[in-house]
């Protein structure tokens, strides 16, 4: 016997050939011998089955002696052994309809797990293995879980079902709901304007929620919220914002924060969090802002940082086309009775310069220049 | 529910191959046939040809020395490709879902034969 | 082939009169025709299926009758959005064919 794999929802084409390559009389049947489909002439005939309005035949090929089965929007109580009557020829089919569904919303946060769900008709025995969009296999019966969603598991994951060395295949659409970045850095001098983006690593038509910016600066002995907002259909409307400092937002996507002077006292981490209609939980990341400044008193010029910097970060203070005079994994550097010039302050990771300020050291008898 | 794209060369000239793809959106590609059929300016609808998912063709006796349909099921694709065409294969070509009736059509590709 | 000849070739009406479009088949095709509504810049839409059929979506004031060789569509009351070029089609045999279609204008 034939058999015949079909997914849920699907159309299926089950063929029966007749050994005349002419137009003559058939009928398919179910196991229970129900009619189901036939011809009288060039009529096409539908029997009392449950099928009935999600049959069909293709008239055209009748004259080449095929006698086509076509169920519509199969359903996985369709599993069944269909039985085609041409002439003196009997051929059976069997029918065997697969479904496979994601546990709730194919739209899911970072972190949270998926749960795949195989229906199958009663008597099967199909295994099912399925890829995810970053090439991770994963096997399983009728049930495939992935617990800890990462970014890179959005997209589509191509999941087949093995049943009597016969395969079909299905294509689900996984959305990750995360920012593009977990974390970000800005490296900005002081009285410079800070602007903080959150791209979305995906994209849905409306989108609604609310977030929050709450930041911690290293000065501080606890964090403070410093902005909160809502989200309507991609539209951004601030709801609460702090009087120091006084963030903008930007009305639009992506999620984007402009600092208007970046000061000693912001330098710190913040986290900013999305809550998104009809999820749990919410979406995050984090920011860092780290702060520069270069000064001269008297005769002590001094270069400082503030904020989250790695202690591999090097903080020199140069001569501009000499060598550096000081140079320390340290937040703060000095020269004593610097030589006239200008200066160059630099924070830098493995030689490449991450932040740089510059300041005009003038002849003892003049006050100093900051360009 | 079912959507169909289709793209391909606006303009060609005698004696080249026509060549147009189908992309089917939502819904079944396995158990139904894609046909193709082209209307030449301002006269009828004229069927092509047409193919299954298992690559099972028919196609119209009159076209049928010039004409190749093929299916790439990984990408729930059709193509059309026609050869040798002269001015008379000037038309707005149209992709289609068949059973026995054509439901529903692509947005049709207008194809300029000239030299 | 299958010859399929439709009448008129033209047609003018009004906004809420009846129109009566015939097609006939070179030779008998039971009930394998469909109806087809066709407006120029888009693609054509079916009407009518199994000569008699109405097409999910497509308003009660299109019919179809007919079987053998002779086939009508009817359409009971024109509104605005009908105004177009209808063909009918066999799907009995291969190759499928066409009618050379009747354009319904506006009187």
């Known amino acids: 016997k034939k058999v015949v794999l079909g997914k849920k929802g699907d159309t299926v084409e089950l063929t029966c050939t007749a050994s005349q390559k002419k137009s003559i009389q058939f009928h398919w049947k179910n196991s229970n011998q129900t009619k189901i489909l036939g011809n009288q002439g060039s009529f096409l005939t539908k029997g009392p089955s449950k099928l009935n309005d999600r049959v069909d035949s293709r008239r055209s090929l009748w004259d080449q002696g095929n006698f086509t089965l076509i169920i519509k929007n199969l359903k996985i109580e369709d599993s069944d052994t269909y039985i085609c009557e041409v002439g003196d020829q009997k051929e059976e089919v069997q029918l065997l309809v697969f479904g496979l569904t994601a546990n709730s919303d194919t739209h899911l946060l970072q972190g949270q797990s998926l749960t795949l769900t195989l229906e199958s008709p009663p008597g099967s025995s199909p295994s099912v293995q399925c890829r995810s969009p970053r090439g991770k296999n994963i096997q399983g019966g009728k049930t495939l879980s992935v617990s800890q969603l990462e970014l890179q598991d959005s997209g589509t994951w191509t999941c087949t079902v093995l049943q009597n060395q016969k395969k079909v295949e299905f294509k689900i659409d996984i959305v990750v709901l995360a920012f593009q970045k977990a974390s970000s850095i800005v490296y900005k001098k002081e009285g410079e304007q800070v602007e903080f983006s959150f791209p979305l690593a995906f994209t849905v038509e409306k989108l609604t929620g609310s977030g929050e910016l709450w930041w911690q600066a290293e000065r501080a002995s606890s964090s403070k919220s410093w902005i909160t907002f809502d989200l309507k259909n991609k539209e951004v409307s601030v709801k609460r914002v702090t009087q120091d400092p006084k963030l903008q937002m930007g009305k639009k996507l992506p999620l984007h924060l402009t600092l208007p002077q970046a000061l000693p006292q912001y330098a710190g981490s913040g986290n900013l969090t999305l809550a998104l209609e009809a999820k749990t939980g919410k979406l995050h990341q984090e920011v860092n802002l780290v702060v520069m400044r270069a000064t001269q008193l008297q005769k002590n010029l001094t270069c400082e940082v503030w904020g989250p910097t790695s202690p591999k970060l090097m903080l020199s203070l140069k001569l501009e086309n000499k060598e550096a005079k000081v140079s320390k994994r340290e937040k703060a550097v000095w020269v004593l009775n610097p030589e006239a010039g200008m200066w160059q302050c630099l924070l830098s990771d493995s030689g490449q310069v991450l932040l740089e300020s510059n300041i005009k050291v003038l002849p003892t008898w003049s006050t100093p220049v900051q360009p | 529910q079912v959507q169909l794209q289709q793209w391909g060369a606006g303009l060609l000239k005698p004696s080249e191959t026509l060549s147009l793809t189908c992309a089917v959106y939502g819904g079944s590609f396995s158990g139904y046939y894609w046909s193709w059929i082209r209307q030449p300016p301002g006269k009828g609808l004229e069927w092509i040809g047409e193919?299954?998912?298992?690559?099972?063709?028919n196609y119209n006796p009159s076209l049928k020395s010039r004409v190749t349909i093929s299916v790439d099921t990984s990408k729930n694709q059709f193509s059309l490709k026609l050869s040798s065409v002269t001015a008379a294969d000037t038309a707005v070509y149209y992709c289609?879902?068949?059973?026995?009736?054509?439901?529903?059509w692509g947005q049709g590709t207008l194809v300029t034969v000239s030299s | 082939d299958i010859q399929m000849t439709q009448s008129p070739s033209s047609v003018s009406a009004s906004v809420g009169d009846r129109v009566t479009i015939t097609c006939r088949a070179s030779?008998?095709?039971?009930?394998?025709l469909a109806w087809y509504q066709h407006k120029p810049g888009k693609a054509p839409k079916l009407l009518i299926y199994?000569?008699?059929s109405l097409q999910s979506g497509v308003p009660s004031r299109f019919s179809g009758s007919g079987s053998g060789t002779d086939f009508t569509l009817t359409i009971s009351s024109l509104q605005p959005e009908d105004f177009a070029t209808y063909y009918c089609?066999?799907?009995?045999?291969?190759?499928?064919?066409f009618g050379q279609g009747t354009k319904l204008e506006i009187k």
């Open positions: 089609q066999q799907a009995n045999s291969f190759p499928y064919t």
């Open positions: 193919i299954n998912h298992s690559g099972s063709t």
């Open positions: 289609a879902r068949v059973i026995n009736w054509f439901d529903p």
């Open positions: 030779q008998d095709i039971s009930s394998w």
């Open positions: 199994a000569a008699s």
